[in-house]
Amino acid sequence: KKVVLGKKGDTVELTCTASQKKSIQFHWKNSNQIKILGNQGSFLTKGPSKLNDRADSRRSLWDQGNFPLIIKNLKIEDSDTYICEVEDQKEEVQLLVFGLTANSDTHLLQGQSLTLTLESPPGSSPSVQCRSPRGKNIQGGKTLSVSQLELQDSGTWTCTVLQNQKKVEFKIDIVVLAFQKASSIVYKKEGEQVEFSFPLAFTVEKLTGSGELWWQAERASSSKSWITFDLKNKEVSVKRVTQDPKLQMGKKLPLHLTLPQALPQYAGSGNLTLALEAKTGKLHQEVNLVVMRATQLQKNLTCEVWGPTSPKLMLSLKLENKEAKVSKREKAVWVLNPEAGMWQCLLSDSGQVLLESNIKVLPTW
């Protein structure tokens, strides 16, 4: 007997062909001999089966001797043997309907687990293989699990169900809820305005939740909450903000924070958390602020940086268009009795300048 695989919610067309290429009488029945559908002249007739309002045929094919049974909005329980009776002969087709669903939601937080569950008819023994958007293959039986979802797991998962040497393909769209970047560093000169941006790696119709930015200043012994906010349908409203610093926040996505000026006492690391409505767990993004100050005090020219810098960063002091006078993997450098001219303080990583501050040294008379 012919085997046809179907997908839950889809439409399947079971074929039945007569030797005579003309419209003749036919009937489709299920394994319990209950009439599903047939014809009378140019019209469809329907029996008392549970498929009544989901069964159809194609009248346009009848005069070619084809009498298909179309079943719409397939259910697992539609799995059965269907019998087509035409010209005193019987054609049997076994229909097996499968469903593949994400156990929880298809919108999952980064780091959470994804479980895919296969619904299958009794007596079937299918195998499943899924391919993630980044090309990772996972295999299983009734359930497949992927732990620690990453941002690259966002997208269409393609799963193939194999049964009786036949296969049916499912596509499931998974959205991993995360910030575009896990971490970012902002380099600023003292006194400059600081812009922090927290773009999301996903788009959804309605986004509701609440968030907070905790800040650990390098000079402080403990961290403190700089700002708390609510998100309602992609609109941002500030709930509470510290007096120092007085942060400002954009009203629309992406989440955007402005620090009026970069000061050494603000240099450090922050953690922005976002709790989304109806989701357990939070989204996190780390943000770092490095502040540079160049000063001249009497005969001493000093350049300092505060904040989380890597040990491989180089801090240099140089006179414009000249070789560096001093260059060290430290957070402060100085030059005694600097000659007059425009001095540059540079923070660089493998020759690439991350931050630059200029200071004019006047001639001493």
């Epitope: 009378q40 002249g41 019209f43 007739t45 329907k46 989901r54």
Partner: antibody
């Protein structure tokens, strides 16, 4: 042009029979069904059944089974609907209509003007 | 059998207005199997729409049909004096074919 011409009005007594004719012209009679639809005064449309002029196959709703006979004469491109055991509630205008099967679509595109049948003692 | 229910029974509108007629099937049917007919007093019905949304030959563009499942709609975008009539929906999803009770569109 394509048209269906029906026979004239009839007055019948309860228990009698009536036979309404429907003559087709302007198209190949055997290529399309003829449907019969009736309408009591001030009421809606009620489908009675059909005849396939090519095969002679017919079908009718359960309500009329055993009382209605649908036939055709291909040589004169005419379809007939005979309703027996008439009762007062059969008083209505009886229409014949051409049934078209176009792809998966079926519709009645050409109608006769109707035949008034009055059942009264 | 499938019962077709039309609403409202009567629609009182002025020429130029938009008419929206509803037809509900007692069970889900394919849009392939839904037709609309217009009938004027003393006349035979006239085919307007078949397959839920396809206009029959010679039917003006102001008539449009839509819907799926159990709910279908006939819309007349701007009523003309000749459009005041009774409108019937009809299904041929399966036997017996059934008509709705009709909606009378009358001049306000």
């Amino acid at each position: 042009q394509v048209q269906l011409v029906q026979s004239g009005a009839e007055v019948k007594k309860p228990g009698a029979s009536v036979k309404v004719s429907c003559k087709a012209s302007g198209y190949t009679f055997t290529s399309y069904d003829i449907n019969w639809v009736r309408q009591a005064t001030g009421q809606g449309l009620e489908w009675m059944g059909w005849v396939n002029p090519n095969s002679g196959n017919t079908g009718s709703t359960q309500k009329f089974q055993g009382r209605v006979t649908m036939t055709r004469n291909t040589s004169i491109s005419t379809a007939y609907m005979e309703l027996s055991s008439l009762r007062s509630e059969d008083t209505a205008v009886y229409y014949c209509a051409r049934g078209v099967l176009k792809g998966d679509y079926y519709y009645m595109d050409v109608w006769g003007k109707g035949t008034t049948v009055t059942v009264s003692s | 059998e499938i019962v077709m229910t039309q609403s409202p029974a009567t629609l009182s509108l002025s020429p130029g207005e938009r008419a929206t007629l509803s037809c509900r099937a007692s069970q889900s049917i394919s849009s392939t199997y839904l037709s609309w007919y217009q009938q004027k007093p003393g006349q035979a019905p006239r085919l307007l729409i078949y397959g839920s949304s396809t206009r029959a030959t010679g039917i003006p563009a102001r008539f449009s049909g839509s819907g799926s499942g159990t709910d279908f709609t006939l819309t007349i975008s701007s009523l003309q004096p000749e459009d005041f009539a009774v409108y019937y929906c009809q299904q041929d999803d399966h036997l017996p074919l059934t008509f709705g009770g009709g909606t009378k569109v009358e001049i306000k």
